[in-house]
Interface confidence: low
């Protein structure tokens, strides 16, 4: 499918509005720090040479790739070196690998200022008085924010914005019209961030043999009636979509993701009776739709898989004559039956089951050598399903704070060597397991628990990556997609790791303390918990509670005197050494 | 993988016959009810005809009926599209596609109808 002009083909494929938007997400994903203005500049610059190729396919430097074009726009931002350092090298390489040096220096944790959410009057002024400029700004920081934000759904993310300061700031009461949808969007888009953050992992550290191993299964699930040649025909096409966005291809990105969308609405009746109300809505809504849409309902009669994946004497040869074929079939019938597993437990049955194949198959008698392999999943399927089990168990007796605490206690004794932000976000995020997954019913426990910690684990690979310190977390992270959350379990108190010294500076808190919100609170009182932890791995249960207790009292106490500031210079010190001695 | 490759395009005059092929592979072809679609440069794509996994069952569209036959050969996971009495109107870039769908999962072949 080849254009004499790759840019003229996506400017009129997407659209003038989409096409710059996408651009603009695809420079702040690569240059985090260069300010909004240069950015938009670059983009209308880009813009405006699309819209001559498009007039004429032959006119000068039309013909060159989007790569050749966008790498040589970011090229010519003049504080390349002084903001980015050796980013600035990259202008050195020609395509292919200048966009690859491009890619390797995305930042996962840019050092930027947290987002500060202005006065609603404000905001509603702003927005009033160019609404073009407000709705870029926040692609803008958003995408600097988060560079592997999946740049399709971005768009359908800003289109929420804008509805909602169009609907609230005609309301009476606008802030508690837009507050609430701003803390939905700033949620869902941090979820939908680290969502896609490990498909691209999946994509750039393991391959796109295991991308397509997820979508089969994940699709399997919830297309149980379509056949397996359509879930191919998606996988296929969806590793395409997502192999081009982690790639920073964000225009072939949007544009594919659009095509598969209209391909799975004219073709509903073999794919999922779910389908229909999604397809009635507009492009970018739809999209969205089709991604987050629920299981379709099994076909009733399915038969047992036993019959041609174990009593069959052709499996080895089936297995012989096309082996990922094969593999991929044995995924998609065990997920379409199995709604009830969690994504990565479908992947490790099936790793589990090659790997019976791998042996057997090679065996005097292979049918009897394979014969019991169904009974060897059942340890792998109880592992998750007694995680799940004591997890909600103890969620609903702590509640989600002390939850979280619990599991900044476990994650610390673990893997010490971790910074302590990286360990509070982390922990934070596990921790919100439990309000997300255990109040579903018990066949939907699982899927929600085990996937979405995969996504917070990863969030924690990536962050490692960066400033590698721990040989276990780089095990656990490295060694096998699917086994890493059952890595991160299994690991024990660090025998190995020499106690931080302890430093009372980080134990030290003023009476600004006391006009944090809740949340604030709760990371700083998390935070010296991790240090605790830090210094005193060996603290059982019952001493952190204690010295936490105390904490927390001590912050009351100082909160609710006349003179704060005074209070806690007083009686800081005495926490200080009254934690200590409890923990000595 | 699903994989689809047509073959058996070409030029040829007002009048002519070709005929074009689709090898599958990747999948249960004998499973699954297939199609030709087409399309010219500049138009959407179009639905040519259809056939049932077993073969027995043919569809049409109106501009070729008569014209056009569709069959297949499971053994050889091979579909076909015999076309007679070719018009310059049906020059268009040729596909196969599983089901009944109009967009495009492969290179397809081109046919080019000219005196």
């Known amino acids: 499918d080849t254009h004499k002009s790759e840019v003229a083909h996506r400017f009129k494929d997407l659209g003038e509005e989409h096409f710059k938007g996408l651009v603009l997400v695809a420079f702040s994903q690569y240059l985090q720090q260069c300010p909004f203005e240069e950015h938009v500049k670059l983009v209308n610059e880009v813009t405006e040479f699309a819209k001559t190729c498009v007039a004429d396919e032959s006119a000068e430097n039309c013909d060159k790739s989007l790569h050749t074009l966008f790498g040589d726009k970011l090229c010519t931002v003049a504080t390349l070196r002084e903001t980015y350092g050796e980013m600035a090298d990259c202008c050195a390489k020609q395509e292919p690998e200048r966009n690859e040096c491009f890619l390797q220096h995305k930042d996962d944790n840019p050092n930027l200022p947290p987002l500060v959410r202005p006065e609603v009057d404000v905001m509603c002024t702003a927005f009033h008085d160019n609404e073009a400029t407000f709705l870029k700004k926040y692609l803008y920081e958003v995408a600097r924010r988060h560079p592997y934000f999946y740049a399709p759904e971005l768009l359908f993310f800003a289109a929420r914005y804008k509805a909602a300061f169009a609907e609230c700031c005609q309301a009476a009461d606008k802030a508690a019209c837009l507050l609430p949808k701003l803390d939905e969007l700033r949620d869902e888009g941090k979820a939908s961030s680290a969502k896609q953050r490990l498909k691209c992992a999946s994509l750039q550290k393991f391959g796109d043999r295991a991308f397509k191993a997820w979508a089969v299964a994940r699709l399997s699930q919830k297309f149980p009636k379509a056949e397996f040649a359509e879930v191919s025909k998606l996988v296929t096409d969806l590793t395409k979509v997502h192999t081009e966005c982690c790639h920073g291809d964000l225009l072939e990105c949007a544009d594919d993701r659009a095509d598969l969308a209209k391909y799975m609405c004219e073709n509903q009746d073999s794919i999922s009776s779910k389908l229909k109300e999604c397809c009635d809505k507009p492009l970018l809504e739809k999209s969205h739709c089709l991604a987050e849409v629920e299981n379709d309902e099994m076909p009733a009669d399915l038969p047992s898989l036993a019959a041609d994946y174990v009593e069959s004497k052709d499996v080895c040869k089936n297995y012989a004559e096309a082996k990922d074929v094969f593999l991929g079939m044995f995924l998609y019938e065990y997920a379409r039956r199995h709604p009830d597993y969690s994504v990565m437990l479908l992947l490790r049955l099936a790793k589990a089951y090659e790997a019976t194949l791998e042996k057997c198959c090679a065996a005097a008698d292979p049918h009897e050598c394979y014969a019991k392999v169904f009974d060897e999943f059942q340890p792998l399927v109880e592992e998750p399903q007694n995680l799940v089990k004591q997890n909600c168990e103890l969620f609903e007796q702590l509640g989600e704070y002390k939850f979280q605490n619990a599991l900044l206690v476990r994650y610390t004794k673990k893997v010490p060597q971790v910074s302590t932000p990286t360990l509070v976000e982390v922990s934070r995020n596990l921790g919100k397991v439990g309000a997300k997954c255990c109040k579903l019913p018990e066949a939907k426990r699982m899927p929600c628990a085990e996937d979405y910690l995969s996504v917070v684990l990863n969030r924690l690979c990536v962050l490692h990556e960066k400033t590698p310190v721990s040989e276990k977390v780089t095990k656990c992270c490295t060694e096998s997609l699917v086994n890493r959350r059952p890595c991160f379990s299994a690991l024990e108190l660090d025998e190995a790791y020499v106690p931080k010294a302890f430093n009372a500076e980080t134990f030290t808190f003023h009476a600004d303390m006391c006009t944090l919100s809740e949340k604030e609170k709760q990371v700083k009182k998390q935070t010296a918990l991790v240090e605790l932890v830090k210094h005193k791995p060996k603290a059982t249960k019952e001493q952190l509670k204690g010295v936490m207790d105390n904490f927390a009292a001590f912050v009351e106490k100082c909160c609710k005197a006349d003179d704060k500031e005074a209070c806690f210079a007083e009686e800081g010190p005495k926490f200080v050494a009254a934690s200590q001695a409890a923990l000595a | 993988q699903v994989q689809l490759q047509e073959s058996g395009g070409g030029l040829v005059q007002p009048g002519d016959s070709l005929r074009l092929s689709c090898a599958a592979s990747?999948?249960?072809?004998?499973?699954?009810?297939m199609s030709w679609v087409r399309q010219a440069p500049g138009r959407e794509p179009e639905w040519v005809s259809a056939?049932?996994?077993?073969?027995?069952?043919?569809r049409y569209a109106e501009s070729v009926k008569g014209r056009f036959t569709i069959s297949r050969d499971n053994a050889k996971k091979t579909l076909y599209l015999q076309m007679n009495t070719l018009k310059p109107e049906d020059t268009a870039v040729y596909y196969c596609t599983i089901g009944r769908s109009t967009s495009r999962g492969s290179q397809g072949t081109q046919v080019t109808v000219s005196s």
């Open positions: 990747g999948f249960t072809f004998g499973s699954f009810g």
């Open positions: 056939i049932d996994s077993g073969g027995a069952d043919t």
